[in-house]
């Protein structure tokens, strides 16, 4: 017999972390950001 379809509520297909730094000119500083991207 074929199984009845019971879906799970969600699946995380992939998740990536990207770090970036940006020079802010004469301030000699950096802005560090963390971007989280996920597909649900």
């Amino acid at each position: 017999d074929a199984e009845f379809r019971h879906d799970s509520g969600y699946e995380v297909h992939h998740q990536k972390l990207v770090f970036f730094a940006e020079d802010v000119g004469s301030n000699k500083g950096a802005i560090i950001g963390l971007m989280v991207g996920g597909v649900v």
Partner: antibody, heavy 121, light 112 residues
Framework: QVTLKESGPGILQPSQTLSLTCSFS??????????VSWIRQPSGKGLEWLAH???????RYNPSLKSRLTISKDTSRNQVFLKITSVDTADTATYYC?????????????WGAGTTVTVSS | DVVMTQTPLSLPVSLGDQASISCRSS???????????LHWYLQKPGQSPKLLIY???NRFFGVPDRFSGSGSGTDFTLKISRVEAEDLGVYFC?????????FGAGTKLELK
């Protein structure tokens, strides 16, 4: 509050097509995981599952009746339909629709009160 | 089709008794996702079935704790610890692991 209500012709003759409607409230068939099944029960006997329709219009049928069954839905009107062709006296039964709630429950939690269908010449 | 065999078909009890109903399936009800889709319903005369227990042992909302479900694979049991008058009716087990979905023939819980 989830409610379902079945409606049908009451009486029809052999060889005719039975058309049933399940009108529901308290949930939407556009919601991921939701579904509705049709189940029937001859008087004083057991339960027989007929067909199921999912929120995404995927369908499942009882293989023993598949050639005679068509399930469909009107999401905007909160209705599910079942057609049974070439009916015979063996199709005389109370017909129920039931709400299927998916993840994380995966159960048929609420049934309608049923509509009685008699096939007689 | 998966055949659901319930025993007994009739169960005479006195109020306050413990009642036990067995349900056996012709094949394992463990779905490929790991869940076991075995459920119990109570149907009273002139009414539609009402869900009591889902996925073997989970009580549905509002179901008294005198109802409990257990089992695994192909062998399942519904127990009522102290039968009350409102518990009388026909109990059905049901599997939703395979197509077609199937039901047991029912167990009628009645007074002695």
């Amino acid at each position: 509050q989830v409610t379902l209500k079945e409606s049908g012709p009451g009486i029809l003759q052999p060889s005719q097509t039975l058309s049933l409607t399940c009108s529901f409230s308290g949930f939407s068939l556009s919601t991921s995981g939701m579904g509705v099944s049709w189940i029937r029960q001859p008087s004083g006997k057991g339960l027989e599952w007929l067909a199921h329709i999912y929120w995404d219009d995927d369908k499942r049928y009882n293989p023993s009746l598949k050639s005679r069954l068509t399930i469909s839905k009107d999401t905007s009107r909160n209705q599910v339909f079942l057609k049974i062709t070439s009916v015979d006296t063996a199709d005389t039964a109370t017909y129920y629709c039931a709400r299927y709630d998916g993840y994380p429950y995966w159960y048929f939690d609420v049934w309608g009160a049923g509509t009685t269908v008699t096939v007689s010449s | 089709d998966v055949v659901m065999t319930q025993t007994p078909l009739s169960l005479p009890v006195s109020l306050g008794d413990q009642a036990s109903i067995s349900c056996r399936s012709s094949q394992s009800l463990v779905h490929s996702n790991g869940n076991t889709y075995l459920h119990w319903y109570l149907q009273k005369p002139g009414q539609s079935p009402k869900l009591l227990i889902y996925k073997v042992s989970n009580r549905f909302f509002g179901v008294p704790d005198r109802f409990s479900g257990s089992g695994s694979g192909t062998d399942f049991t519904l127990k009522i610890s102290r039968v009350e008058a409102e518990d009388l009716g026909v109990y059905f087990c049901s599997q939703t692991t395979y197509v077609p979905l199937t039901f047991g023939a029912g167990t009628k819980l009645e007074l002695k």
